[in-house]
Interface confidence: low
């Protein structure tokens, strides 16, 4: 079958890193500079991705594989294959249309990306707050009040008065 296919289609003999050049009687020509073909038998080479601006090159393009980009410091990748770079914020902040904003009281973000999320409501699990939450850290829930030894006390924070993901403008 392979031999028959080769006779029918001379392009099938062209290896990765080349293309089947219709303008030159279907001979296998090397991919031009800044292009690649990752499989044999290609009729064109794909132009290499260029990691410019906020993108930086993680892996150089070769004749057989595309370049791979990541983001410059202060930014992180979004989308398949790092198709976008988004600005980092500090822990305790979230990115809004107006830039990085501190998390509202009752919410936290322990990463440089993503949105502020509400503190865990310990009482929903019948537990008490062992360590208060901050803008950067969730609360730490402890044993239920009934399990506490006599004389021990717990701190219960007020419930956050907002939806997750919103920041003061």
């Amino acid at each position: 079958f392979e031999r028959t296919r080769s006779l029918q289609d001379p392009c099938s003999n062209c290896p990765a890193g080349t293309f089947c050049d219709n303008n030159r009687n279907q001979i296998c020509s090397p991919c031009p500079p800044n292009s690649f073909s990752s499989a044999g038998g290609q009729r064109t080479c794909d132009i290499c991705r260029q990691c410019k601006g906020v993108f930086r090159t993680r892996k150089e393009c070769s004749s057989t594989s595309n370049a791979e980009c990541d983001c410059t410091p202060g930014f992180h990748c979004l989308g398949a294959g790092c198709s976008m770079c988004e600005q980092d914020c500090k822990q305790g902040q979230e990115l809004t249309k107006k830039g990085c904003k501190d998390c509202c009281f009752g919410t936290f973000n322990d990463q440089k990306r993503g949105i502020c999320r509400p503190w865990t409501n310990c009482s929903l699990d019948g537990k008490s707050v062992l360590v208060n939450g901050t803008k950067e850290r969730d609360v730490v829930c402890g044993p239920s009040p009934a399990d506490l030894s006599p004389g021990a006390s717990s701190v219960t924070p007020p419930a956050p008065a907002r939806e997750p993901g919103h920041s003061p403008q």
Partner: nanobody, 126 residues
């Protein structure tokens, strides 16, 4: 006139399978790379996978590797997406797209593709 027409969508339970088809007409189907994308409500169009013109090179997004398989039948001018072990998060409108001969964009970005079908809805729910 270049046309792409998807079919095969529908409702399926989690863990189930579906096979989508994309019928192409109006151009030399066998000369172009093809891809599948999907778009869930309120989200951006997401690359699923791409198949070179001769089926010799495939690229898949990580979340579908091992579950989805793209294939093509050049004589029939048809692209396929075999989906198995479907999950609720796979619910979306699925689109096929034709790859440009040359593109300055990564193959996983929509700008790399010049013609699109109208989409077929896949719903995964218990």
């Amino acid at each position: 006139e270049v046309q792409l027409l998807e079919s095969g969508g529908g409702e399926v339970q989690p863990g189930g399978s579906l096979r989508l088809s994309c019928a192409a007409s109006g151009w030399a189907f066998g000369n172009y790379g093809m891809a599948w994308f999907r778009q869930a409500p309120g989200k951006e169009r997401e690359f699923i996978g791409r198949l070179a013109w001769n089926g010799g090179s495939t690229d898949y997004v990580e979340s579908v590797k091992g579950r989805f398989t793209i294939s093509r039948d050049n004589p029939k001018n048809t692209l396929y997406l075999q989906m198995s072990s479907l999950r609720a998060e796979d619910t979306a409108v699925y689109y096929c797209a034709r790859q440009r001969s040359y593109s300055r964009y990564d193959i996983r970005t929509p700008q790399t593709y010049d013609y699109w079908g109208q989409g077929t809805l896949v719903t995964v729910k218990p």
